[in-house]
């Protein structure tokens, strides 16, 4: 950065090299230049020679002022016009950022993705600080009292065989940057309560000719828990409604799940499933389209034919076996 | 040789407009500035407006009596400065010059054009 | 902005004569002023700039001189040519500003 260049001279901030977004800044230039008596200072940023709000202080010093100063980052640096030099002398230079003290860390959670090795702690970092801001997640047993520090700048993967103060943790996040420094409140988590199941996967879809057609949605996973609840939401690709069906599974074996739909509309289909009881659910997998058939005919929709796009974590309610609606949508 | 030329100059009516241009030649223009100083009848020099070469991101200032109602604005590629005036008053009657600077101080000026605002 | 106050306002004297123009700057200006002449119905001509610098062209019979806040223009061995309206300008600071005017007539 600008900051490895030879100096004749100091340049400094105030209040700080680092300071909050929108404040009033003043950069001080100090030359000290062999046989020079400046006639006169100039500033620059990122390159660009800055005309207004310069003032002399003495005959090595002056002051450019800036008002509610709202870059991030930005490189000064300043120069001297003396007698008889034809060209500016440089004097010195500094990188300058502003930014945000961080926000209290909050919704803090913590999961275990069955297979995975890891326990994934996450939370909401609130907004954004524009500055380099790290943050320390604590893991603490409950049982032995032990407590653990991990370092990172956004979410934390920890080894679960790291964990070996028992099933009961408290989990707090701290944030800290150059202007300031937050505590979340702390999450009690019981490792059996936060695994995820492997995740659910749609992989093909049909549509058997009978009386009434019926599309039936074959899906899995590889998951080993045995009490499984599940969620397939589904919708018209041309509307903003989803429909929710409510499952409890058992993955021993493929499942196939009937729908009665209208003919000839393309369909979107997503799974999503939780340990029966607990917390945390999957994310929504991946959207998967089918088209039912104008007639008769059986039509296949295999999986990873479709279209992709973002899938959301839009949650429905409903009791087992209950049809509902979703209008909250992606 | 250095040449400043200005025109747009005239009678105009209070509230009234007037755009002014001077064209340069002579040296290089990309990297001077261009500033408007004017002179009421009888009075001192008062800088009017400024505008800075691309070194300066073309940085513009305007005197506290015109803000808001002077544009100074430039054209690198036709080295021609404009100064439009809007909502005229009667203390802009004034000669208006065109000048240059490389450094703070104004090198070089045009030969001035008369603006007076009378009803 | 900084202020310059130029004295005197006006003054007479005879050809030959050595004549001296003040200009007081209300802060230290570091040597960033020049000296302007302006003749009846002309567009003012840069003398001095950089407090002493004597412009390309302008006869050695002009000097300048001065530091801090305190400033002189000098013309030596007045010539006819030399009446004329001289101005300071401060360029230390932005916005530059001129000071008042001296006009010089010749007896």
């Known amino acids: 950065g600008i900051t490895n260049i030879n100096c004749s001279g100091h340049i400094w901030v105030e209040p700080a090299t680092i300071f909050k977004m929108g404040m009033n800044i003043s950069i001080y230039c100090q030359a000290a230049i062999k046989n020079c008596q400046p006639r006169k200072l100039h500033f620059y940023k990122n390159g660009i020679k800055e005309r207004f709000q310069i003032t002399r202080i003495n005959k090595t010093t002056a002051r450019l002022w800036y008002k509610n100063f709202l870059e991030p980052h930005a490189s000064m640096y300043c120069t001297a016009e003396c007698p008889k030099h034809f060209q500016e002398t440089l004097i010195c230079g500094k990188d300058i950022s502003s930014g945000y003290p961080p926000d209290i860390p909050d919704e803090v959670t913590c999961v275990i993705y069955e297979y995975s090795g890891n326990m994934t702690c996450t939370w909401n970092a609130g907004k954004l600080t524009y500055i380099d801001t790290k943050y320390v997640v604590h893991v603490k047993s409950l049982e032995t009292e032990e407590e653990q520090q991990y370092l990172t700048s956004s979410y934390i993967n920890i080894s679960t065989d790291s964990l070996q103060g028992g099933k009961k943790y408290l989990v707090w996040v701290q944030a800290a940057n150059a202007l300031g420094m937050e505590e979340s409140k702390q999450l009690q988590i019981h490792l059996d309560d936060i695994v995820i199941p492997s995740a659910a996967v749609i992989s093909r879809a049909e549509t058997i000719n009978a009386t009434v057609p019926k599309t039936i949605i074959y899906w899995d996973s590889q998951t080993t828990i045995e009490k499984v609840s599940c969620e397939m939401r589904y919708k018209a690709t041309t509307n903003q409604t989803w429909n929710v069906k409510e499952f409890d599974t058992n993955f021993t074996y493929v499942q196939q799940s009937e729908f009665y739909l209208e003919p000839n509309i393309k369909y979107v289909f997503q799974v999503r499933c939780q340990e029966t009881g607990k917390r945390y659910w999957q994310p929504w997998s991946s959207p998967f389209f089918h088209k039912t058939p104008e007639t008769v005919p059986q039509v296949t929709s295999k999986a990873f034919q479709h279209d992709t796009w973002n899938s959301g974590l839009t949650v429905a309610s409903i009791s087992t076996g209950h049809l509902t609606s979703d209008n909250r949508g992606d | 040789e250095v040449k400043l030329v200005e025109s747009g100059g005239g009678l105009e009516q209070p509230k009234g407009s007037l755009k002014l241009s001077c064209t340069v030649s002579?040296?290089?223009?990309?990297?001077?500035?261009m500033s408007w100083v004017r002179q009421a009848p009888g009075k001192g020099l008062d800088l009017v407006a400024d505008i800075n070469s691309k070194s300066y991101n073309y940085a513009t200032y305007y005197a506290d009596s015109v803000k808001d109602r002077f544009t100074i604005s430039r054209d690198d590629s036709q080295s021609m400065v404009y100064l439009e005036m809007d909502n005229l008053k009667t203390e802009d009657t004034a000669l208006y010059y065109c000048?240059?600077?490389?450094?703070?101080?104004?090198?070089?000026w045009g030969q001035g054009v008369m603006v007076t605002v009378s009803s | 902005d900084i202020q310059m106050t130029q004295s005197p306002a006006s003054l007479s004297a005879s050809l030959g004569e050595t004549v001296s123009i003040e200009c007081l700057a209300s802060?230290?200006?570091?040597?960033?002023l020049a000296w302007y002449q302006q003749k009846p119905g002309k567009s003012p001509q840069l003398l001095i700039y950089h407090a002493s610098s004597l412009q390309d062209g302008v006869p050695s019979r002009f000097s300048g001189s001065g530091s801090g806040t305190q400033y002189s223009l000098k013309i030596n061995s007045l010539e006819s040519e030399d009446a004329a309206t001289y101005f300071c300008?401060?360029?230390?600071?932005?916005?530059?500003?001129f000071g008042g005017g001296t006009k010089l007539e010749l007896k």
């Open positions: 300008l401060q360029d230390s600071e932005y916005p530059p500003t």
């Open positions: 802060e230290d200006i570091y040597n960033n």
């Open positions: 000048t240059v600077h490389h450094s703070d101080y104004f090198e070089y």
């Open positions: 002579g040296f290089d223009f990309n990297s001077a500035g």
